[in-house]
């Protein structure tokens, strides 16, 4: 058993049928010695008397808010949460496996640049009685500071019969140098509590591996005289690290017909312009990627050919 | 410790082309190592990230773009002095800082070259003959060093009398390649910045 925060405790249980559970001793936070009784949650049934209460915690029915009273007055509370260990592995009931980029990916994180700012998000089908708290650091043995905000509900989607909820959090490394070569990964830890169930999820990454630039901006077409060709031009996104000659991007330009089946023409360039043939009803899209370290491509920025 | 924005002579930068080749070569070699050594811990998540140049060179700091010198987190107090004469410095206007930067890059390359050659000698003794260093990568390191053209003491190749532990050697190869790829990215960024300056 360990303390999650003041008066909230997590009991770790080896979770299998007929498991013996864990013996927990609760102590009433009071100078009083006599006439103390204990109850659980809203029930008025007295579980025991005395300054300490010994309970065998086996299942969720044994968890909850234990309260000690004296003469009708509440003295203190202890909230017990359960953390299930199923065959050597901590349970992951609260969050959905996003399966990208690999199985057992519960937290996904992205950074728009090398400033040390990043966003993480996760999915759940649970809509109520749910709280998250997020901590982060650079490295784990001698951790350096990363500050995270509060997790917020950022999207709701309908998936088949289920509603899916997306939560996200923004974090900022306290003293980040965009040009630094990372040798210690960023660690992100999310505590999740649903009703009386506690779970924790972690992710470990280098900023360089989670870079995903914003799409190129100011995408424009300039028709070339007496030709079906157009000059496409664009600019680096505002959110990208500067100077651009040091933090260079490479670009992919795509001409896509109206039908998804039509052949796509693709050009790769390090410049911020390209000459392509603009077909009728087609659209031109451009996306960006770090020129030197192949992390994710940005989303597409698009303009119609007409 | 920074690079001022200079106005170099046209075509000053043969090093840009070499640094791009270097990044391509080390990335290919790392990909090959990860595929060949699939039963070894060779992914970025599994290896310890070690930098053999740590406390010996200070490439990131010495080559910091002018725009980032205002960022206190980028200004490390490590001081290292280097020899300063190189053929990439085609313009006399180029500052001492730029020379220091390129000299630091040269030292990095020299250290990695020695490590890779020592390692290759061990890998050639492996009865499994599982993996060797790509000669193209070694050649590209050499070409960039020649383009930088700094005079510096030659570092003797390390020779080891004890029987090599091939498992450990292959894991060390992965660690070295990951670190060298990261340094090659920095070198490429620096060369691109200098080329644009």
């Amino acid at each position: 058993i360990w303390e999650l925060k003041k008066d909230v405790y997590v009991v770790e249980l080896d979770w299998y049928p007929d498991a013996p559970g864990e013996m927990v001793v609760l102590t009433c936070d009071t100078p009083e010695e006599d006439g103390i009784t204990w109850t659980l949650d809203q029930s008025s049934e007295v579980l025991g008397s005395g300054k300490t209460l010994t309970i065998q915690v086996k299942e969720f029915g044994d968890a909850g808010q234990y309260t000690c009273h004296k003469g009708g007055e509440v003295l203190s509370h202890s909230l017990l949460l359960l953390h299930k260990k199923e065959d050597g592995i901590w349970s992951t009931d609260i969050l959905k496996d996003q399966k990208e980029p690999k199985n057992k990916t519960f937290l996904r994180c992205e950074a728009k640049n090398y400033s040390g700012r990043f966003t993480c998000w996760w999915l759940t089908t649970i809509s109520t009685d749910l709280t998250f708290s997020v901590k982060s650091s650079r490295g784990s043995s001698d951790p350096q500071g990363v500050t995270c905000g509060a997790a917020t509900l950022s999207a709701e989607r309908v998936r088949g019969d289920n509603k899916e909820y997306e939560y996200s959090v923004e974090c900022q490394e306290d003293s980040a140098c965009p040009a630094a070569e990372e040798s210690l990964p960023i660690e992100v830890m999310v505590d999740a509590v649903h009703k009386l169930k506690y779970e924790n999820y972690t992710s470990s990454f280098f900023i360089r591996d989670i870079i995903k630039p914003d799409p190129p901006k100011n995408l424009q077409l300039k028709p070339l005289k007496n030709s079906r060709q157009v000059e496409v031009s664009w600019e680096y996104p505002d959110t990208w690290s500067t100077p651009h000659s040091y933090f260079s991007l490479t670009f992919c330009v795509q001409v896509q017909g109206k039908s998804k089946r039509e052949k796509k023409d693709r050009v790769f360039t390090d410049k911020t312009s390209a000459t392509v043939i603009c077909r009728k009803n087609a659209s031109i899209s451009v996306r960006a990627q770090d020129r030197y370290y192949s992390s994710s491509w940005s989303e597409w920025a698009s303009v119609p050919c007409s | 410790r920074n690079l001022p924005v200079a106005t170099p002579d046209p075509g000053m930068f043969p090093c840009l082309h070499h640094s791009q080749n270097l990044l391509r070569a080390v990335s290919n070699m790392l990909q090959k190592a990860r595929q060949t050594l699939e039963f070894y811990p060779c992914t970025s998540e599994e290896i310890d990230h070690e930098d053999i140049t740590k406390d010996k060179t200070s490439t990131v700091e010495a080559c910091l773009p002018l725009e980032l010198t205002k960022n206190e987190s980028c200004l490390n107090s490590r001081e290292t002095s280097f020899i300063t004469n190189g053929s990439c410095l085609a313009s006399r206007k180029t500052s001492f800082m730029m020379a220091l930067c390129l000299s630091s890059i040269y030292e990095d390359l020299k250290m990695y070259q020695v490590e890779f050659k020592t390692m290759n000698a061990k890998l050639l003794m492996d009865p499994k003959r599982q993996i060797f260093l790509d000669q193209n990568m070694l050649a590209v390191i050499d070409e960039l060093m020649q383009a930088l053209n700094f005079n510096s003491e030659t570092v003797p190749q390390k020779s080891s009398l004890e029987e090599p532990d091939f498992y450990k050697t292959k894991i060390k190869l992965c660690i070295l390649l990951h670190a060298f790829r990261i340094r090659a990215v920095t070198i490429d960024r620096v060369m691109s910045y200098l080329n644009a300056s």
């Epitope: 299998y16 049928p17 199923e86 050597g88 057992k104 | -």
Partner: antibody, heavy 115, light 112 residues
Framework: QVQLVQSGGGVVQPGRSLRLSCAAS????????MHWVRQAPGKGLEWVAF????????YYADSVKGRFTISRDNSKNTLYLQMKSLRAEDTAVYYC????????WGQGTMVTVSS | SYVLTQPPSVSGTPGQRVTISCSGG????????VKWYQQLPGTAPKLLIY???QRPSGVPDRFSGSKSGTSASLAITGVQAEDEADYYC????????????FGTGTKVTVLG
């Protein structure tokens, strides 16, 4: 004490269907994940499928994906395995078992797929 | 397709020490715990060892488990006639959990 009693096995022709049941008692069935495991005559153990405590997630071996469906009725304390498009290679003793560091197994039920 | 490899058979005389190996990889035994089961003819498997080296209550202390790197082993010190059975190791693969990975199985024969 924990008990898992299986039923529903038998002889079936290739291409036909069969549903196995596993009735649980002696524990809070709705709190635990459950597996199906099979064993072909004279062969080793092969995992077939798993279902979470609340039925929200199901996992299958590649050999049965798309043909077998694991399900549970927590109000009846029962686990099911619906088997469709049965093949000769599905012939085996099928076991249900609880998920956890300590597990409990059903007695097994024989499924024979033969024409 | 079995990813955990066991010897098909091992044998020993009563009182002898018998060991069964179970060889896997970094993504299964290398990163997860191992269980061992005993299966007597015509019966369901019975848990002998969980968490690499833990014995459930009721399992004789002549059975012991260990794990090193990507391999595990089960030892029976002072093998007895009633130990003649099939033995299976089991682990998980970190990419396909909670799918159970079973070993190929080992037949233990007690001679004499």
């Amino acid at each position: 004490q924990v008990q898992l009693v299986q039923s529903g096995g038998g002889v079936v022709q290739p291409g036909r269907s069969l549903r196995l049941s596993c009735a649980a008692s002696g524990f809070t069935f709705s709190s635990y994940g459950m597996h199906w495991v099979r064993q072909a005559p004279g062969k080793g153990l092969e995992w077939v499928a798993f279902i979470r405590y609340d039925g929200s997630n199901k996992y299958y071996a590649d050999s049965v994906k798309g043909r077998f469906t694991i399900s549970r009725d927590n109000s009846k304390n029962t686990l099911y395995l619906q088997m469709k498009s049965l093949r000769a290679e599905d012939t085996a003793v099928y076991y249900c078992k609880t998920h956890g560091s300590h597990d409990n197994w059903g007695q097994g039920t024989m499924v024979t797929v033969s024409s | 397709s079995y990813v955990l490899t066991q010897p098909p058979s091992v044998s020993g005389t009563p009182g002898q020490r018998v060991t069964i190996s179970c060889s896997g990889g970094r993504s299964n035994i290398g990163s997860d715990t191992v269980k061992w089961y005993q299966q007597l003819p015509g019966t369901a498997p019975k848990l002998l060892i969980y968490g690499n080296d833990q014995r459930p209550s009721g399992v004789p202390d002549r059975f012991s488990g260990s794990k090193s790197g990507t391999s595990a082993s089960l030892a029976i010190t002072g093998v007895q006639a009633e130990d003649e059975a099939d033995y299976y190791c089991q682990s998980y693969d970190r990419g396909t959990h909670p799918a159970l990975l079973f070993g190929t199985g080992t037949k233990v024969t007690v001679l004499g």
